[in-house]
Interface confidence: medium
């Protein structure tokens, strides 16, 4: 349906509060360096304009597209050239090229310092003084650090954030109330950001088909009672929603997401028995609840897959006359029967099935050729199962920090050209898979671990794409979305790597290390470990263990010393010399 004024349509659909929040997020994701006050002003102006268009749809400029209106507004920012350099050139282009240009300048690693919360009393004062501004600042700070954050979900988290402050600012011990709640929210927000970045990368690098396949598998696992037509309808709508958000069309995205939630709730009888309590909630909570809803029980009477996909005489006809739909049905049927498999594994199985049919349907006797296709899946299933088993055993033995260090060593040896901060960030996140997944029951471990690894490895791919330094990383990232994890797992030590020159500055530490929070202390030590490996890539695990043990003792000793700085400057060079000697 065409509207006279697109901006009025979205304003009316979303309501003023959500509209303003989404505009603020959109601008913050595009112009990540601009101060908060500038974005508040821009968002206010756009909201006022939308309100005027809602009152009078034929008003001046109300008929312009959202890209035109937003782009024109962005291009009024005076400091564009100074702050963003060649991004200012985008303003010389016409739509849709101008928007594409802005999207291309989104920075996944803007390098802002981590958000540090002020004292609880100051926070509560700011919250109570101007709640709207306080929550706007939250939206801004998250959005500029995460330019692909799923905007409607960010509105939901802002609402949660508001709830935390409303509760804790009344508490006797504000700090004790706020601390754990804010930390738990922070973890959720970071995971949400990484998951959406993965979805956007799937769409942008591998296209709609890859995203749809991923969604069919995931939703078929979650809603095994829904039939394929229902799953297909939801997947089509979900693809549109994420394409819009990944493309910066946040108003359309949020509006379409609300419509999808409405559809699912109106048709819950044919989707899942688990949607009931989600559907009684207001729109933001409803959509979030539906996205996180627990898996429905499997129907009891599912026939064998072989009947349709192996034994049926029409397999090749089905495949050749409608490949995508036939493979989609295969994926759907397989996924709903295997909630314990990771989505990545299910997609690999579908790919294997496709390859088998491609080969067999060209032979004289296709049924004989593909008769054993389902048995041939065994090695594909065994690989992630064994990987999860081995790594969870290692995690249980070493704990999170030790497991992260083992992964740091592993990944630095695979791709030593990658920057140290990236290796540390990615290995720390990979290490969290142990904490997140290894305590789960056997039936949930693989799905939890492999799908989480896919999200983390996507972060590596995104950062590496910005400054490519390793051909093998480029290869694993770009060849196949579903095989990224096996590709990285299969990388051996890079024998072509020329060790980095020793730089004493890299291994110089100061007393400020002692006052750092534990997580930041770990990052410092892990940074040293990576640099050590880049200098001595042939170091054995035993040697590294010794050196890291010595390093830990050195930090402990100096942090307990009377003259901390003196201890660091005196003992540091001795430690470095001993480490070099140990690693010969």
């Amino acid at each position: 349906e065409a509207y006279k004024s697109e901006i009025a349509h979205r304003y009316n659909d979303l309501g003023e509060e959500h509209f303003r929040g989404l505009v603020l997020v959109a601008f913050s994701q595009y112009l990540q360096q601009c101060p908060f006050e500038d974005h508040v002003k821009l968002a206010k102006e756009v909201t006022e304009f939308a309100k005027a268009c809602a009152a009078e749809e034929s008003g001046a400029n109300c008929d312009k597209s959202l890209h035109t209106l937003f782009g024109d507004k962005l291009c009024t920012v005076a400091s564009l050239r100074d702050k963003y350099g060649d991004m200012a050139d985008c303003c010389e282009k016409q739509e849709p090229d101008r928007n594409e240009c802005f999207l291309a300048h989104k920075d996944d690693n803007p390098g802002f310092p981590p958000l540090v919360a002020p004292e609880p009393d100051a926070l509560c004062a700011a919250f109570q003084d101007n709640e709207q501004l306080f929550l706007g600042k939250y939206l801004y700070e998250i959005a500029r650090r995460h330019p692909y954050f799923y905007a409607p979900e960010l509105l939901y988290y802002a609402q949660q954030y508001k709830g935390v402050f409303a509760e804790c600012c009344q508490a006797a011990d504000k700090a004790a109330c706020l601390g754990p709640k804010i930390e738990a929210l922070r973890e959720k927000v970071l995971l949400s950001s990484a998951k959406e970045r993965f979805k956007c990368a799937s769409l942008q690098k591998f296209g709609d088909r890859a995203f749809k396949a991923w969604s069919v598998a995931r939703l078929s696992q979650r809603f095994p009672k829904a039939d394929f037509a229902e799953i297909s309808k939801v997947v089509t709508d979900l693809t549109k929603v994420h394409k819009e958000c990944c493309h910066g069309d946040l108003l359309e995205c949020a509006d379409d997401r609300a419509d999808l939630a409405k559809y699912m709730c109106e048709n819950q009888d044919s989707i899942s028995t688990k949607l009931k309590e989600c559907c009684d909630k207001p729109v933001l909570e409803k959509s979030q609840c539906l996205a996180e809803v627990e898996r429905d029980e499997l129907p009891g009477d599912l026939p064998s897959l072989a009947a349709d996909f192996v034994e049926d005489k029409e397999v090749c006809k089905n495949y050749q006359e409608a490949k995508d739909v036939f493979l989609g049905t295969f994926l759907y049927e397989y996924a709903r029967r295997h909630p314990e498999y990771s989505v990545s594994l299910l997609l690999r199985l579908a790919k294997e099935y496709e390859a088998t049919l491609e080969k067999c349907c060209a032979t004289d006797d296709p049924p004989t050729c593909y008769a054993k296709v389902l048995d041939e899946f065994k090695p594909l299933v065994d690989e992630p199962q064994n990987l999860v088993k081995t790594n969870c055993e290692l995690f249980e033995k070493l704990g999170e920090y030790g497991f992260q260090n083992a992964l740091l060593v592993r990944y630095t040896k695979k791709a030593p050209q990658v920057s140290t901060p990236t290796l540390v960030e990615v290995s720390r996140k990979l290490g969290k898979v142990g904490t997140k997944c290894c305590k789960k029951p056997e039936s949930e471990r693989m799905s939890c671990a492999e799908d989480f690894l896919s999200v983390v490895l996507n972060r590596l791919c995104v950062l590496h794409e910005k400054t490519p330094v390793s051909e093998r990383v480029t290869k694993c990232c770009s060849e196949s979305l579903v095989n990224r994890r096996p590709c990285f797992s299969g990388l051996e030590v890079d024998e072509t790597y020329v060790p980095k020159e020793f730089n004493a500055e890299t291994f110089t530490f100061h007393a400020d290390l002692c006052t750092l929070p534990e997580a930041e202390k770990q990052v410092k030590k892990q940074t040293a470990l990576v640099e050590l490996l880049k200098h001595k890539p042939k170091a054995t695990d035993e040697q590294l263990k010794t050196v890291m043990g010595d390093f830990g003792a050195f930090v402990e000793k100096c942090c307990a010393a009377e003259n901390k700085e003196g201890c660091f400057s005196e003992e540091g060079p001795k430690l470095v010399a001993a480490a070099q000697a140990a690693l010969v």
Epitope: A229, P303, E321, A322
Partner: nanobody, 126 residues
């Protein structure tokens, strides 16, 4: 739930024609694999023709190929079976069956269809 209601059966002479209809409710007919089966007295139920869901791929038993045509009218939510050059051995109760779980896949195995009509009798006799 899918409800199916067949009509159009009757007595016809050999060489004659009949058009069976199957009206569906509770589900859009283009979203589900649908098929016609038949059962002659004292015999097993057998597949006659099918059409895939979402994609119009048609399937026929060898015994009816070239004589019978399966089609659907999405606007009327109805499935049809046009039967020409009828033979005495075509005499049977004809059933319409639907399989919404997997559109596209029209199986020839009756057990894989959860929804059935009550059947309409076709008698071919002089």
């Amino acid at each position: 739930e899918v409800q199916l209601l067949e009509s159009g059966g009757g007595l016809v002479q050999p060489g004659g024609s009949l058009r069976l209809s199957c009206a569906a409710s509770g589900r859009y007919i283009d979203e589900t694999a649908v098929a016609w089966f038949r059962q002659a007295p004292g015999k097993e139920r057998e597949f006659v023709a099918g059409i895939g869901g979402g994609v119009d791929i048609t399937y026929y038993a060898d015994s009816v190929k070239g004589r019978f045509t399966i089609s659907r009218d999405n606007s009327k939510n109805t499935l049809y079976l046009q039967m020409n050059s009828l033979r005495p051995e075509d005499t049977a109760v004809y059933y319409c069956a639907a399989r919404p779980g997997s559109p596209l896949i029209t199986s020839k195995v009756a057990d894989l269809y959860p929804y059935w009509g009550q059947g309409t009798l076709v008698t071919v006799s002089s």
